[in-house]
């Protein structure tokens, strides 16, 4: 063991370092000192530090831990929360302009049915905004008020347009016989089923990446123990007591020292690891009917079809309502009047051609890529931490939080410690309540995330076989029934292109009537202009 | 004919709470959406909350969320509106009313004091 | 309020009289509007609906219109029983809820 070179004879070197560390000098001794009441920094001979500089050195190395931990998780944290601001806005963007493809589809096929129509889109589509940012919204729910309000409508300007204006007399006798009659078939179940699974998704994957800037945020603005903090001490500042100015803590006392301090965090570990496996199987499944881009720009089509339905079935539907809401007060006689052989085309879908350019689904999978490099991120933040403070090269000639030495051995400070604190004790410890929440939080989103992503969640409820549509007419390659129909087959473009909406947003949103609101052509959508180049840390 | 009869108003403390009810009758409940709206004396209207007509979704206004709840019985045709943590200012006439985006049938109110 | 009425309008017996409603893209000018009139003591009540139509037992008197993000009702024939309180109402997309202009008090002079 080398002995320790000779001590500042006045502390000069100390006082100058302290003084940057708190301005005044009253506290720092001229001439090293016994040093006997010092707690942390035990002295092996004179020292220049007192007490209260051991307690500021404790507080600094608390602080600088901290900020050592939130520069660590700068990367990832910058990476979610981007991405999370992205995909909502996103998400809107989609929301918005399925709504205006079906406030288009009804002006441009059903004008007599505006504004009526556009308000229960609206409605509808309001709905679909608040349920995919984890309101209490059920979709069943929605979707019936769609077509409880549509029937109404449809029935008193398509249907029957010689009834007067003042049909609200007899709207509630129309919205009973809607279910009771199933007027639009099956469609309403379609697209309960189609929308309900994909903003499912949609919403777990938005709650998913919230709790991740949760969980960094939490672990972010940890508050480190005193026994951590004397231990920080001891590695990063006990050295300059003996006025060892600079000399680095060994990189292997380093590592024990952080293991110990972390230990509480490094137990999100396990659970961080099955987040982002478990986020990358939802968005594995995100496509055909899991995938809200898919599903709500090909709504307005279904919709279409559904009043197509209705016109179809138009002659034996009018003379059942006839009778049935002749005096909408006697709706007890309802069920007398269910019509025997309403049509019902069988092959009522036909699917669209999607072209997949840059897609919401692709940013997805970027995502995940970049998030599985930090998939050991908790497990290796001791590691990273020692490597991204000063420690000695190779444990050669360092501080082992007691002396210099010329080669670290863990053992011997091991055994150096055991007289100030036990490091297995804290180890022991446990979590902090905090990392506690977080653990019991990301157990529950992994839960959801894996009931999510079960394979038999992903076949399409078989009970639609059940309703009317043959087997086969929305089979797996069909994109679940998805798409356009008949004469008007739809070819959605680009299926959103949505970084550059980011950018610039349509001003066609939300203005039935306006003249440059977008609409759905005969043949074809041309989603949206591209503006090529825009600046994305997802790029 | 469509009837909305509100009941359980009263005077009540700040930081108490209280129970609107309100029977319906003449239509059926369960298809629609449902809402409470109030009007503070002298005041306009102030739409409260909403349910749906399943009572699977619910909506609040910014004001008094958190500390009302909305809810339903289909079998019993009433819906109601728990209050709590009321304030001074929620002292209004509380309206239910048939609808979610507009209203086409009221009730009569009921009168919700809010003092020391 | 998010939507302006003006708070009084008034005129003789068999006059026209209109009630303006004005608002914003994200209210008005992205959905319907309703009009209620509500009597002093008494509960509103349903005057127009989807910018204008009327529910059956409301006379012809009254007829709404909408123009971009703006809105009226007017009053034809003004009788003195139509002393009211009226409300205009919309939906609010940025705010997810229904809105209500301030209400105009209609007097019949």
């Known amino acids: 063991q080398p002995p320790p070179p000779p001590p500042d004879a006045t502390c000069h070197q100390v006082r100058s370092f302290f003084q940057r560390l708190q301005p005044g000098l009253k506290w720092v001794p001229e001439t090293p000192v016994p040093g006997s009441d010092l707690q942390v920094c035990l002295p092996k001979g004179p020292t220049c530090c007192s007490r209260k500089m051991e307690e500021k050195y404790q507080l600094t190395a608390r602080l600088n831990m901290e900020q050592l931990l939130q520069s660590a998780s700068m990367e990832l944290k910058f990476l979610i929360i981007q991405n999370a601001a992205v995909f909502q806005e996103a998400f809107e963007i989609v929301v918005r302009h399925a709504k205006n493809y079906t406030n288009a589809m009804f002006k441009n096929n059903y004008p007599s049915l505006t504004p009526q129509a556009f308000e229960f889109v609206g409605e509808f589509f309001t709905d679909v905004s608040l349920y995919i940012l984890g309101s209490d919204i059920n979709v069943d729910d929605m979707v019936n008020e769609l077509f409880d309000s549509l029937f109404p409508v449809i029935y008193t300007q398509l249907m029957n347009p010689g009834l007067p204006d003042s049909a609200l007399d007899i709207n509630e006798c129309l919205r009973g016989a809607r279910r009771d009659l199933k007027v639009f078939g099956n469609f309403p179940k379609l697209i309960m089923t189609q929308v309900s699974k994909s903003l499912q998704v949609t919403r777990i994957f938005l709650q998913a990446l919230n709790l991740g800037i949760e969980v960094i945020n939490t672990t972010d603005h940890l508050k480190f123990s005193k026994d951590c903090g004397r231990m920080l001490t001891r590695m990063w500042y006990c050295s300059y007591c003996q006025g060892l100015m600079m000399v680095k803590p060994c990189g292997g006392y380093c590592n024990v020292v952080m293991q110990g301090c972390m230990a509480g965090v490094v137990e999100i570990d396990k659970y961080w690891r099955e987040y982002i496996l478990s986020l990358e199987e939802l968005v594995n499944g995100m496509y055909r009917i899991y995938d809200m881009e898919n599903v709500l720009l090909g709504l307005f089509s279904t919709i279409h079809d559904s009043i197509q339905y209705v016109q179809k079935n138009a002659g034996k539907l009018t003379t059942t309502i006839g009778k049935l809401c002749a005096h909408s007060q006697q709706r007890q006689y309802r069920s007398a009047y269910y019509p025997e052989d309403l049509f019902i085309d069988k092959k009522v879908l036909k699917v669209a051609h999607v072209e997949h350019e840059e897609t919401l689904s692709s940013r997805r999978r970027e995502l995940i890529q970049k998030l599985k490099s930090f998939i050991s991120f908790y497990s290796a933040l001791p590691g990273y931490i020692c490597s991204h403070s000063p420690v000695a090269e190779n444990d050669t000639l360092c501080w082992n939080g007691q002396e210099l030495v010329e080669r670290y051995s863990q053992k011997a400070a091991r055994n150096g410690m055991k007289n100030q604190f036990n490091l297995h004790e804290l180890k022991m410890k446990g979590p902090e309540p905090v990392v506690s929440q977080i653990i019991d939080k990301l157990k529950h989103i992994n839960q959801l995330l894996r009931t999510m992503s079960m394979p038999k969640g992903r076949v399409l409820d078989k009970n639609l076989d059940e309703e009317g549509f043959e087997s086969g007419d929305c089979g797996d390659d069909e994109d679940e029934c998805i798409g356009g129909s008949g004469d008007g087959m739809i070819k959605v473009k680009n299926q959103l292109r949505f970084l550059a909406e980011l950018a610039y947003d349509l001003d066609v949103d939300d203005a039935p009537g306006n003249s440059q609101q977008a609409t759905p052509k005969d043949n074809e959508i041309s989603t949206f202009h591209n503006l090529g180049n825009v600046h994305s840390p997802l790029k | 004919e469509v009837q909305l009869l509100e009941s359980g108003g009263g005077l009540v403390q700040p930081g108490g709470s209280l129970r609107l009810s309100c029977a319906a009758s003449g239509f059926t409940f369960s298809s629609y959406a449902m809402s409470w709206v109030r009007q503070a004396p002298g005041k306009g209207l102030e739409w409260v909350s909403a349910i749906s007509g399943s009572g699977g979704s619910t909506y609040y206004a910014d004001s008094v969320k958190g500390r009302f709840t909305i809810s339903r019985d289909n079998s019993k045709n009433t819906l109601y509106l728990q209050m709590n943590s009321l304030r001074a200012e929620d002292t209004a006439v509380y309206y239910c009313a048939r609808g979610k985006r507009y209203f086409d049938y009221w009730g009569q109110g009921t009168m919700v004091t809010v003092s020391s | 309020y998010e939507l302006t009425q003006p708070p009084s309008a008034s005129g003789t017996p068999g006059q026209r009289v209109t009630i303006s409603c004005s608002g914003g893209?994200?209210?008005?000018?992205?959905?319907?509007v309703n009009w209620f009139r509500q009597l002093p003591g008494t509960a509103p009540k349903l005057l127009v609906y989807?910018?204008?139509q009327r529910p059956s037992g409301v006379p012809d008197r009254f007829s709404g219109s909408k123009s971009g993000t703006s809105a009226s009702l007017a009053i034809g024939g003004l009788q003195s029983d139509d002393e009211a309180d009226y409300y205009c109402?919309?939906?609010?997309?940025?705010?997810?809820?229904?809105?209500f202009g301030g209400g105009t008090k209609v007097t019949v002079l």
């Open positions: 109402v919309a939906w609010d997309d940025s705010l997810n809820a229904p809105v």
């Open positions: 893209s994200s209210n008005i000018g992205s959905n319907t």
């Open positions: 989807f910018n204008n």
